[in-house]
Amino acid sequence: APTSSSTKKTQLQLEHLLLDLQMILNGINNYKNPKLTRMLTFKFYMPKKATELKHLQCLEEELKPLEEVLNLAQSKNFHLRPRDLISNINVIVLELKGSETTFMCEYADETATIVEFLNRWITFCQSIISTLT
């Protein structure tokens, strides 16, 4: 059974994951982002179901494509590079989903834009956090 300390750690990790996903989304939605139109042409796979931590496997499998799309930003001056954000997200996802059981991700038939994709995983984090608090 999960202890209060492990629940607290999970909650904190989810909060950090949520913050970085929101940061990526904010940067993409920035009205000054000239690459937004191109970014929106890329399609992402959405999970058929995302209600448990094991479903983060579906996010993990889309992190490389996400980084590639974020690289389109090509800012001369990054405070954080896309690879910094994706690396941190990957570490959190691996810790949260665990490696004990192998979960085969099932994807929905419809693909999504980067904005829809990020919003889906932001909602996922918020939903899980709400069950822990």
Partner: nanobody
């Protein structure tokens, strides 16, 4: 408007350590990047290290393994632990607050704190 107050600079011998702190106040959003840039005399301002509210970090190659950036989200404070300092680390260190992972005109900057590494 965001206000940034830096502290912790000073004079230190080569090989020594310093810890910089920067507290942000005002219109703070939970989603942000805070970090440190530096500017040596006659040189351009350059990134030292940055950290997102979610914990993503970026370090300049020249400080990797020597400097560690951390933050306390509850206190809106960012820290830079600087170890094994070298004379070439001498510069004015500026705290930065940004709402995005890339630079734009909405970024905020502190007044700067002098770090001098000299024997």
């Amino acid at each position: 408007e965001v206000q940034l107050v830096e502290s912790g600079g000073g004079l230190v011998q080569p090989g020594g350590s310093l810890r910089l702190s920067c507290a942000a106040s005002g219109s703070i959003f939970s989603i942000n990047v805070m970090g440190w840039y530096r500017q040596a005399p006659g040189k351009q301002r350059e990134l030292v290290a940055a950290i997102s509210s979610g914990g993503s970090t970026n370090y300049a190659d020249s400080v990797k393994g020597r400097f560690t950036i951390s933050r306390d989200n509850a206190k809106n404070t960012v820290y830079l632990q600087m170890n094994s300092l070298k004379p070439e680390d001498t510069a004015v260190y500026y705290c930065m607050y940004a709402s995005s992972w890339y630079e734009d005109e909405t970024d905020y900057w502190g007044q700067g704190t002098q770090v001098t590494v000299s024997g």
